[in-house]
């Protein structure tokens, strides 16, 4: 699609994974395409096969090593190429000079748990997964709580402007079922974006004591 629109977007999880999405108007669903990664100062190179995720969109993960290994640094540049098969040859469709630490998207936070719950408040903690030690404390979080009768989209966002892996939710309703999610973002990187939301954590506030005002 010479005059069509294509998009090649990749993110580094800060450790050992580059996830890429390639989309192109008018491309055939059964087109065979790959992403090739060539770092400028590393001995390795890596390839992944783009698999269809929607009508004209393909995705794949470049696995660079063990999940917690630090495979790239702030000075690395990785040349990423999309190659698609045309008959017997591979044709380069897109090229990007990828700066990993300018294009960060971390893994969703994990291990959410209720530390303490009362009638009107709940203390929740979580952990970050596969996040580089380079960030030190330069991370921020967003959290949201799903109340009965509402959708996630309606839930107000709570912003934690520091590396704080817990939150105390207040002004909750007694004996009520809630769900909670959190996501994380490094402060570094021009094209850096939020991680996916964590798996929801369900919890219930304690009932109000009988005969007492709430």
């Amino acid at each position: 699609a010479v005059n069509g629109t294509s998009q090649f977007t990749c993110f580094y999880n800060s450790r050992a994974n580059i996830s890429c999405v390639w989309s192109q108007d008018g491309a055939l669903q059964d087109t065979s395409c790959q992403v090739h990664a060539w770092p400028d100062r590393r001995r390795w190179n890596q390839t992944c096969e783009l698999l269809p995720v929607s009508q004209a969109s393909w995705a794949c993960n470049l696995i660079l090593g063990a999940p917690d290994s630090q495979k790239l640094t702030t000075v690395d540049i990785v040349t990423l190429r999309v190659l698609c098969r045309e008959g017997v040859r591979w044709r380069v469709m897109a090229i990007q000079d990828f700066k990993p630490f300018e294009n960060l998207r971390l893994m969703a936070p994990i291990s959410l748990q209720v530390v303490h719950v009362e009638t009107h408040r709940c203390n929740i903690s979580w952990e970050i997964s596969q996040a580089s030690h380079y960030f030190e404390r330069h991370l921020e979080f967003e959290a949201r709580t799903l109340s009965p009768g509402h959708t996630w989209e309606e839930a107000p966002l709570l912003t934690l402007k520091q590396k704080q892996e817990w939150i105390c939710l207040e002004t909750l309703t007694p004996d009520t079922q809630y769900e909670f999610q959190v996501r994380v973002k490094p402060l570094q990187g021009e094209f850096t974006t939020w991680s996916p939301w964590s798996q929801p954590l369900a919890f219930r506030t304690k009932p109000a004591a009988l005969g007492k005002d709430t």
């Epitope: 998009q7 400028d40 040349t79 469709m93 897109a94 090229i95 000079d97």
Partner: nanobody, 123 residues
Framework: QLQLVESGGGLVQPGGSLRLSCAAA????????VGWFRRAPGKEREFVAA????????LYADSVKGRFTISRDNAKNTVYLQMSSLKPEDTALYYC????????????????WGQGTQVTVSS
């Protein structure tokens, strides 16, 4: 805002050579991958060549491969299109364009455009 200015066009005989330049005003071009496109009279605008700024990786249209070379000069903040073995069918208005991150053959993937420089190949 990135403003692109092309130069170097002109009249040349078949088999001759020409070098087009693309310079930036307003912002450093070195932050952007750059492509060259052309529009021949009565035809659609078509992709010619493109280059990424850091690694210097290149893409070419099949019709110009082996005859045209795209390059960049970091010190001069300029991208060049060296055209040789020119043919009458290379006659067109040549545009320089900058993309945000990725070079492709699709003109819709480029965000900033110059006004163009005319290349005429004729005896």
């Amino acid at each position: 805002q990135l403003q692109l200015v092309e130069s170097g066009g002109g009249l040349v005989q078949p088999g001759g050579s020409l070098r087009l330049s693309c310079a930036a005003a307003g912002r450093a071009i070195e932050n952007y991958p750059v492509g060259w496109f052309r529009r021949a009279p009565g035809k659609e605008r078509e992709f010619v060549a493109a280059i990424t700024w850091i690694s210097g990786s290149t893409l070419y249209a099949d019709s110009v491969k082996g005859r045209f070379t795209i390059s960049r000069d970091n010190a001069k903040n300029t991208v060049y299109l060296q055209m040789s073995s020119l043919k009458p069918e290379d006659t067109a208005l040549y545009y320089c364009a900058a993309a945000l991150k990725t070079i492709t053959r699709g003109q819709n993937d480029y965000s900033y455009w110059g006004q163009g420089t005319q290349v005429t190949v004729s005896s």
